[in-house]
């Protein structure tokens, strides 16, 4: 077989026929260097996702219950290509799992025991396993027969197709639990008609039922949906407040040699030939002689997943979790009030070694998990290996992105109610040796600059959103000669001047030395003409303050501010003369974790805060030698955030207009493959 | 700060047992925290267990219930029994204090722990 062919596989013999067809009509539109495809047949999806992993098949479109079994191991599968639903300027790549009830109700999410349940089938995924799934820890015990445990949670329910003989709860509110339209409770509109007419107290349906089913927006405010955090919202906020984010079909691959950018040219070049009408003679869409062979019927069209997008996170953390809870059915031992220790992510071995540390002193309150980079702990906060870690100001727009939200804020000044009082935020400012006295911010072109790494506030968004204003394009690496910007391309100009040995090159994390706010201002004093960082950074590296061989003689007079006014100004005065004001460090985790990471946090500070004064007897949670590992040094408590708990609201308009605009140049795989999820 | 030596290592079957010792040049009494990591061919070094000045311990779930660590201040040593050993626990053993920071790799040479029959 040629390298550029796509094994496709088909899992019956009207699959088969219709995969010979596109093999056939491909080769008549496509040049012969270019993809082909060969069909291989299985006898079912399971068969199919052992022959891609096995390299005997290349590519299948499946639901998302078949993707997670296509992620687990031994498979390693992974999503590559999206179909999507609705138009090409609105695409619908996912729908929600939502639970519908009267406004006037008065319940929670938890405190559905006892309540009357309606279904829209038994074993289907918005109407019972992403539901059952999420509430399978609260169901009596013994939790196997399901069902049974299912009808003795809730007080009577409708779930169409279950065995009304064995299990007559789950069809009280439907006789019989007929399997068809011929049951009136049948599906996601026979669902929503159970709550309706009164029947039921809850529906488990997608987010699009309740306007397929109510045109007036008059009927559909009588109705509110059940958050996860134990809220309610109108139905038409359906993104903030669901069970879960369910793809609706994907094409999966090997995650390893699996031919991800080959299957996506083909697809690509095939909707664009035998897409939504395009041809008569073979339509991608259609299945004359069946339903959904290949692709859906209802799809118009494909988009590629982004490569940064592994099962987990394209399924989301909600689906995986309620599927995971079916299959395995193992739960906490007794669910309790009490907090599970709240797992932290430490990067590289430096923060990992705090971390330990902080996990000994901690009494099993505090675990530790470790990423290379920002944005593979953020990718574990949202996937659940990981819990929490404090954030830049650039990174909790990416976390926020992602889901996650703000939970306690870095605030940096002594005050009386220090936890009471979030702080207005610090200054990023721009940093140049007194004896470049030539050098303003309005001639940095051809300058070697010190980065404290990209998508960081003080260090990129805001000088390279400046800059972006001024030169209108994102070639950075060109403006200046060079620099060091960890988490720049390792060929960029932007990891010349940078220090790490071998890989650790240019890394974004304290294997790189010049890496975070000392080590942008240690590339200044070393190799630099400018670095971007906070106000504190020049005094807390210099005077002696900082005992390192690099800095132990470095005096605070021999450095000056760039103001953006085109003059210079002494270090001290960087309230009139900085780049702008940026949102403080903050600790981010998932919505489900928020109560917990700040009742934790705000124990763990008092224990180990900047209450403590003796830090070499004794372990200090907000000191590192300057290094600002997991918190920043210079913290001296971590502050409610009162109203300020989502990303926006904490950022600020300001600040997150500024890093939108950013976003074109932006090359986070992650802000990518979130905003694929959630545009 | 205190200079670490660690002894106690050697090969030993499956399900055996071995005392690890961490002799220190000086007094551990006003040392908080004290732990015993591990480091296999290939693999980063793991926190093993953990012990505060106060006697807290923690473990890594792997060897919950089969190591023990202790500190005995008065003779400025740290210990980790190490009972019904595994193929998996073979690994060069390192102790710290963590008092020269998180920054700096100062870890000394280790005592090599071999399971195997």
């Known amino acids: 077989v040629p390298d550029k062919t796509v094994r496709w596989c088909a899992v019956s013999e009207h699959e088969a026929t219709k995969c010979q067809s596109f093999r056939d009509h491909m080769k008549s539109v496509i040049p012969s260097d270019g993809p082909s495809v060969a069909c291989v047949k299985k006898a079912s999806y399971l068969d199919c996702i052992r022959a891609i992993a096995a390299n005997e098949a290349d590519a299948v479109t499946l639901d998302a219950g078949l993707v997670y079994d296509a992620y687990l191991a031994p498979n390693n599968l992974k999503p590559v290509v999206a179909e999507f639903y609705g138009s090409k300027e609105d695409p619908q790549t996912f729908y929600y799992a939502v639970a519908v009830v009267k406004k006037d109700s008065g319940f929670q999410m938890n405190q559905l025991r006892g309540k009357k349940s309606c279904h829209t089938g038994l074993g289907r995924s918005a109407g019972w396993n992403i539901p059952i799934g999420l509430l399978y820890c609260d169901l009596p015990e013994p939790r196997k027969p399901l069902e049974k445990a299912v009808a003795n949670f809730f007080s009577g329910s409708c779930a169409p197709c279950a065995d009304g003989t064995d299990f007559p709860q789950l069809c009280q509110l439907c006789p019989g639990c007929g399997c068809s339209t011929l049951n009136q409770y049948f599906g996601y509109s026979g669902a929503f008609k159970c709550l309706k007419d009164g029947a039921g107290d809850v529906a488990f349906v997608k987010h699009s039922t309740i306007f397929e089913n109510l045109a007036n927006k008059a009927d559909r405010d009588q109705y509110e949906l059940l958050c996860l955090d134990n809220t309610r919202k109108p139905v038409d906020e359906y993104k903030d407040c669901h069970l879960a984010q369910v793809p609706s079909h994907t094409v999966v691959a090997r995650s390893m040699g699996g031919k991800e950018d080959l299957i996506w040219e083909l697809l690509n070049q095939a909707q664009e030939h035998f897409g939504k009408d395009k041809s008569k003679e073979f339509q991608l869409f259609s299945s004359p002689h069946g339903k959904d062979l290949l692709f859906k019927d209802s799809a118009h069209g494909f988009l590629k997943v982004p490569p940064r997008m592994d099962a987990k996170m394209y399924l989301g953390y909600e689906y995986v979790t309620a599927i995971r809870n079916l299959r395995e059915g193992t739960c906490p031992e007794a669910p309790t009030d009490e907090c599970k220790p709240v797992k932290w992510c430490a990067l590289s071995h430096h923060e990992r070694l705090k971390c330990d540390e902080w996990s000994v002193n901690s009494v099993g309150k505090i675990e530790c998990v470790s990423a290379e980079t920002t944005e593979d702990c953020i990718a574990k906060i949202m996937n659940g290996e990981a819990d929490a870690m404090s954030l830049d100001g650039g990174f909790v727009y990416i976390a926020g992105k992602c889901g996650l939200v703000p939970v306690l804020a870095e605030n940096y000044n002594k005050s009386d109610n220090c936890e009471d009082t979030p702080e207005a935020g610090y200054f990023a400012i721009a940093v140049v040796k007194k004896s470049a006295s030539d050098l303003t911010w309005d001639n940095l072109k051809g300058k070697k600059s010190c980065h404290t790494a990209v998508g960081r506030t003080a260090g990129w968004n805001i000088p390279m959103g400046l800059l972006y204003n001024k030169i209108n394009h994102c070639r950075f690496d060109e403006f200046f000669s060079e620099g060091c910007a960890p988490g720049s391309k390792k060929d960029s100009s932007l990891c010349k001047l940078c220090m790490g040995s071998g890989l650790n090159l240019c890394e974004p994390n304290n294997k790189e030395g010049y890496y975070g706010y000392t080590g942008a201002f240690r590339c200044l004093v070393e190799k630099g003409d400018v670095a971007f960082v906070k106000h504190q950074t020049v005094p807390q590296n210099t005077g002696g303050k900082n005992p390192d061989p690099w800095a132990k003689n470095l005096n605070e007079k021999d450095y000056e501010l760039l103001c953006l006014d085109g003059t210079r100004k002494p270090v001290e005065e960087y309230a009139n003369c900085h780049l702008a004001r940026a949102p403080n460090h903050a600790v981010v985790t998932r919505k489900d974790k928020e109560a917990c990471v700040h009742k934790i946090l705000r124990q763990q500070q008092h224990l180990f805060g900047s209450n403590v004064t003796d830090c070499s007897g004794n372990f200090c949670l907000f000191r590192s030698e300057t290094k600002d590992l997991l918190f920043r040094d210079d913290t001296v408590c971590l502050a409610k955030l009162h109203d300020r708990n989502t990303y926006e609201k904490y950022l600020g308009e300001e600040y997150v207009k500024a890093v939108g605009n950013l976003r074109k140049c932006s090359t986070s795989s992650l802000l990518e493959a979130c905003t694929f999820r959630r545009p | 700060q205190v200079q670490l030596v660690e002894s106690g290592g050697g090969l030993v079957q499956p399900g055996g047992s071995l005392r690890l010792s961490c002799a220190a040049s000086?007094?551990?009494?006003?040392?908080?925290?004290m732990a015993w990591y591990r480091q296999a061919p290939g693999q980063q070094r793991e926190l093993v267990a953990g012990i505060t000045r106060g006697g807290s311990t923690k473990y890594a779930d792997s060897v919950k219930g089969r190591f023990t660590i202790s500190r005995d201040n008065a003779k400025n040593t740290l210990y980790l029994q190490m009972n019904s050993l595994k193929p998996e626990d073979t690994a060069v053993y390192y102790c710290t204090d963590y008092s020269r920071g998180y920054y700096q790799d100062y870890w000394g040479q280790g005592t090599q722990v071999t399971v195997s029959s």
């Open positions: 000086g007094s551990i009494a006003s040392i908080n925290t």
